[in-house]
Amino acid sequence: GITIPRNPGCPNSEDKNFPRTVMVNLNIHNRNTNTNPKRSSDYYNRSTSPWNLHRNEDPERYPSVIWEAKCRHLGCINADGNVDYHMNSVPIQQEILVLRREPPHCPNSFRLEKILVSVGCTCVTPIVHHVA
Amino acid sequence: GITIPRNPGCPNSEDKNFPRTVMVNLNIHNRNTNTNPKRSSDYYNRSTSPWNLHRNEDPERYPSVIWEAKCRHLGCINADGNVDYHMNSVPIQQEILVLRREPPHCPNSFRLEKILVSVGCTCVTPIVHHVA
């Protein structure tokens, strides 16, 4: 692989745990310039595997509120609007990064944390286990 | 209100941009102790709104690899295994936090960034607009 030279303007870290502890600019840059986050707002109702959104709140974490999807049914909604139990509603999960103050109550010291969140649900064909 | 005292073990920041720039411990704590991330690994094939996963790689970002979902069809797979265009496959999107090296190529200096990622797809009833 190509070795990219270290930028001479990089800040130095005197921290004894370096490089585990790094400097982070908290002024968030938003890359989603052409996106409209509202566009998927009603999928949870219109989906054949609809879901409810539950509030997961922790003031010591950033973001403090995370909305978690919980599938409404075990099965999926068919063309007649009924639940078809030959199909399964399953959560689509994703690991996301969050910030947590560490040590607690320190204004300028944080730790990255990885948490698994359910973003929505999808309808899948079940895996059928045949008993011999 | 009660004033919570600052933890005496808090690190100091000598950075000229402080307090926008803070110390973050990258030794990531994983809260997903009881979860099995593999359990949703085949949903992209079994879903009635199947998707392909595309590798989005950027060495200047953490995490450097993000998997992006792209729905395979405009419609959804019906019981016969055919695409039903009376239904729509749509991406479920979520905004996530990532770290970007800033200045570029610096090993210990980052900026928070927010990006929109497609996590998977779900099958929805279309919104029909009637023309007068």
Epitope: S41, N52, E57, P59, P63 | P19, R20
Partner: antibody, heavy 124, light 109 residues
Framework: QVQLQQSGPGLVKPSQTLSLTCAIS??????????WGWIRQSPSRGLEWLGR?????????DYAVSVKSRITINPDTSKNQFSLQLNSVTPEDTAVYYC??????????????WGQGTLVTVSS | EIVLTQSPATLSLSPGERATLSCRAS???????LAWYQQKPGQAPRLLIY???NRATGIPARFSGSGSGTDFTLTISSLEPEDFAVYYC??????????FGQGTKVEIK
């Protein structure tokens, strides 16, 4: 362009119910990226957040502890508006009442659109 | 509940001067959930800054915000005649904890 238009009486008698309505144009009360709140302002209390409603597959109501036992905020999806009801009012509830849109994007929270304000006087 | 204390209560300055307004929280708040508003007599508050340092749409570059933890600052680099008003900071810690500071009045000297 999002706008909020407030309506309701400016005079309420002690022990009665204060009722205000906020009509939304340019956005939806059922939006999943916003919450809709009420804030009041008086010389004695300054700006005081009273509560909010937000829709995320169901309606969520959050109320300030100071008024929790007396307040109700309701949506009216058919008219795209929301209302405030504050029961058992006293002269201490005299204030300018504002409705506002709270941007609620998970990563930020702030009030970007405000109603024009309604001065409500509690007096017999 | 988190108390936001703004200082000074009144700031007397001339047009063209730099204004520095302080907002101190009784506990740590996430900078991402800290906002600043401007209010003129007879008007509703107007959003200036969100996320401690992001200017709202249409807000001139002379307004800037900074801070983290418990200490936040709003700076107006060079006061214009229309900037004389009352300024409020506001924090969101949780869905039930949302508070405003008592305000700083910037008046013409």
């Amino acid at each position: 362009q999002v706008q909020l238009q407030q309506s309701g009486p400016g005079l309420v008698k002690p022990s009665q119910t204060l009722s205000l309505t906020c009509a939304i144009s340019g956005d939806s009360v059922s939006s999943s990226s916003a919450a809709w709140g009420w804030i009041r302002q008086s010389p004695s209390r300054g700006l005081e957040w009273l509560g909010r409603i937000s829709y995320r597959s169901k309606w969520y109501n959050d109320y300030a502890v100071s008024v929790k036992s007396r307040i109700t905020i309701n949506p009216d999806t058919s008219k795209n508006q929301f209302s405030l009801q504050l029961n058992s009012v006293t002269p201490e509830d005299t204030a300018v009442y504002y409705c506002a849109r709270e941007v609620d994007s998970m990563y930020y929270s702030y009030f970007d659109i405000w109603g024009q304000g309604t001065l409500v006087t509690v007096s017999s | 509940e988190i108390v936001l204390t703004q200082s000074p209560a009144t700031l007397s300055l001339s047009p063209g001067e730099r204004a520095t307004l302080s907002c101190r929280a009784s506990q740590n708040v996430w900078a991402f959930y800290l906002a600043w508003y401007q209010q003129k007599p007879g008007q509703a508050p107007r959003l200036l800054i969100y996320g401690a340092s992001n200017r709202a749409t249409g807000i001139p570059a002379r307004f800037s915000g900074s801070g983290s933890g418990t200490d936040f600052t709003l700076t107006i680099s060079s006061l214009e005649p229309e900037d004389f008003a009352v300024y409020y900071c506001q924090q969101y810690r949780s869905t039930l904890s949302l508070t405003f500071g008592q305000g700083t009045k910037v008046e013409i000297k």
